[in-house]
Interface confidence: low
């Protein structure tokens, strides 16, 4: 007799695959055409990522640094009307992607909880979910709750209220802290809160380092759901070396849990890499003409129109991985076992019941390296085969598809391999 | 290089509908939206809608709305306007002009399909 | 909807001049307009297609400024194939509007 299937686990549509954040409409949609009508023609390109959420905003009016010039109900006339946004969720639904809305309250603001009333900005947050959600949004976020007093019992309360909506909506908090204790206390009276953070961020960016802080994480949470980012809101080239981006693209997109991007993460967009553009939201670069101000400031290369066409640019290999990321079961919800490799990577396997399971091997380092794997820490649900087939490399030049020895398996500097191999009974 | 070839001149009575092609080439139709466009003497140019050729969900000028269908064929690259109950009001150049990612204006456009309402 | 006025609907100029077309929102639409040109019998062809950006193949003649409410299209040292129907369109917000047109003649 065939052996009994294991059953599936409750799975969230977060669960299912990325978010991708939009904290600057402006700065997305590029050329100062940054409304709700014009990110609605943006959908599609969205669909192309294969993201399941779009956490936008925040939107709503607030004059900075003034409580009572500050509406969390009320969408900033600069984006467009109710009308346009609830012509945003419409589509975004038609295409299955879901929308967060932050409800960071200062946003343009010095402190974004106002610093000397929070109790009575807590309330306008309590009223705006309760709002919103009749609206139609499909969670909400909230950024920089280090500096909201008693943030563990607000963020409860607003879980509570979310929740009580429905299960099926997202409550998304973002901090700036690294400190393990600090996340995990955050995010102990909360069951399902989504928490980014920078803690991944707080890194040497060796391999051994990156295990080490990834494996410290998973058992300080439990078995809780995690979300991985390098920040609550930036972007990668903001904390990475630039030859670490790939490499990460796919370790966020493997790991258990939530992979978090920001705009232009797909494209390695840099922040303020060109003059005069704000270092918290550049421009995005749709095409060669995204930065009008500097004739040939951007090269095709550097575009999503010019990476579109190219298959071995990090668009691609986004798209790629953000495609296995939401249709294979062992990448959505499998288990997860490190082991021992080669000094300077990080090697993991991930796998579910009978389903095919998924190695990943990161060289972390500036050589070519041996990968050393040693599956004798692997439990026996997890044990290795002597050949895995190449679903894809971060590196040009490997055959797609093709078996690799994995005794013999070499890694080029800075390289990524995400292998495949079946279930053996 | 890259052509949006319409259908032939229409010459038809009032009331009835007529509905007109947009094939494109020489490039991937999915990459960029359509837009129709009216031209006539009366009212110079008047945007109709624009349709996602990758899902084909339409957004019309409501002026429009009663009047126009945008359609898409993947597997053809063809976009089609049909226009329903149709006055002398509706006799104009119809183009097809498409645009990348929907919020760009429209930069390759069709060379017109002239439609005359006369009984 | 917003209101795109060109309020010349003719200009005169000579082969060798500089000549500016305006075009006036109702409303802000930030940098969102973009200039097409028509020549008789034959479909639009796109010039600018956000101020100031020219669309690929159009000659440095064409330049376009404007953001807010007020744009403008100039053609410095005019060409005979320059004659032409001249429309701006903002793409800011939905419905998409056009300009009635400037036509560009000889004196």
């Known amino acids: 007799r065939a052996p009994r299937c294991r059953e599936l686990p409750a799975q969230k549509w977060w669960h299912t695959g990325a978010l991708y954040r939009i904290g600057d409409l402006q700065a997305f949609q590029g050329h100062g055409s940054g409304n709700l009508a014009g990110l609605k023609g943006r959908l599609d390109y969205l669909s192309s990522l294969k993201v399941k959420g779009l956490v936008l905003g925040p939107l709503h009016k607030n004059q900075k640094d003034d409580v009572a010039q500050t509406d969390l109900l009320q969408i900033d006339p600069n984006f467009g009307s109710k009308e346009d946004f609830d012509n945003l969720l419409q589509s975004a639904k038609k295409k299955s992607i879901r929308v967060i809305l932050d409800l960071t309250p200062n946003y343009r603001g010095e402190n974004l909880w106002f610093s000397t009333q929070v109790d009575s900005v807590a309330t306008k947050v309590k009223d705006a979910l309760e709002f919103w959600l009749q609206a139609g949004v499909d969670g909400f976020q909230v950024r920089d709750i280090e500096n909201l007093k008693d943030a563990s019992s607000f963020l409860a309360e607003w879980e509570n209220i979310t929740k009580g909506f429905s299960e099926d909506r997202l409550l998304i908090a973002g901090t700036n802290s690294s400190d393990l204790q600090q996340i995990v206390s955050l995010l102990e009276s909360n069951k399902d809160l989504l928490l980014t953070s920078s803690y991944l961020s707080d890194s040497s960016f060796t391999g051994e380092h990156t295990k080490s802080l990834v494996t410290q994480y998973l058992n300080a949470t439990g078995n809780r759901w995690c979300s991985w980012s390098l920040s609550q809101a930036g972007l990668l080239t903001s904390f990475l070396p630039a030859q670490l981006l790939r490499l990460y693209q796919l370790m966020l997109f493997t790991l258990p849990g939530t992979p978090v991007f920001s705009y232009g993460d797909e494209i390695g967009l840099k922040a303020a890499a060109l003059p005069g553009q704000p270092v918290e939201a550049p421009v995005m670069l749709w095409d060669e003409s995204s930065f009008p101000d500097i004739p040939g400031a951007v090269s095709a290369n550097m575009t999503v129109k010019g990476q579109s066409e190219d298959p071995g640019s990090l668009l691609s290999l986004f798209r790629q991985l953000s495609d296995q990321r939401s249709k294979e079961r062992s990448l959505l919800h499998g288990d997860f076992h490190t082991f021992s490799s080669g000094p300077g990577l990080f090697s993991y396997i991930r796998h579910w019941d009978q389903n095919e399971r998924f190695l990943v091997v990161l060289n972390f380092g500036d050589v070519g390296l041996s990968a050393g794997l040693q599956a004798s820490d692997l439990p026996a649900s997890a044990s290795l085969p002597t050949k895995a087939d190449l679903v894809l490399s971060t590196q040009p030049g490997r055959e797609e598809g093709s078996p690799l020895e994995l005794e013999r398996l070499k890694l080029e500097p800075h390289e990524g391999l995400l292998l495949r191999f079946p279930y053996v009974a | 290089q890259v052509q949006l070839q319409q259908s032939g001149a229409e010459l038809v009575r009032p009331g009835v509908s007529v509905k007109i092609s947009c094939k494109a080439s020489?490039?991937?139709?999915?990459?960029?939206?359509m837009h129709w466009v009216k031209q006539s003497h009366a009212k110079s140019l008047e945007w109709i809608g624009v349709i996602s050729t990758y899902y084909g969900d339409t957004t019309y000028n409501q002026k429009f709305k009663d009047k126009a269908t945008m359609t898409v064929d993947k597997s053809s690259s063809t976009a089609y306007l049909e226009l329903a109950r149709l006055t002398s009001e509706d006799s104009a150049i119809y183009y097809c002009a498409r645009v990348w990612l929907l919020s760009y204006a429209m930069d390759n456009w069709g060379q017109g399909t002239s439609v005359t309402v006369s009984s | 909807d917003i209101v795109m006025t060109q309020s010349q609907r003719f200009m005169s100029t000579s082969v060798g001049d500089g000549v500016r077309i305006t075009c006036k929102a109702s409303?802000?639409?930030?940098?969102?307009v973009a200039w097409y040109q028509q020549k008789p019998g034959q479909s639009p062809k796109a010039l600018i297609n956000?101020?100031?950006n020219r669309h690929t193949g159009v000659p440095d003649r064409f330049t376009a400024r404007g953001s807010g409410t007020d744009f403008t299209l100039t053609i410095s040292n005019v060409q005979s194939e320059d004659l032409a129907d001249y429309f701006c369109l903002q793409h800011w917000n939905y419905p998409l509007t056009f300009g009635a047109g400037t036509k560009l003649e000889l004196k």
């Open positions: 409303q802000n639409v930030r940098t969102a």
């Open positions: 956000l101020a100031p």
């Open positions: 020489g490039y991937t139709f999915t990459d960029y939206a």
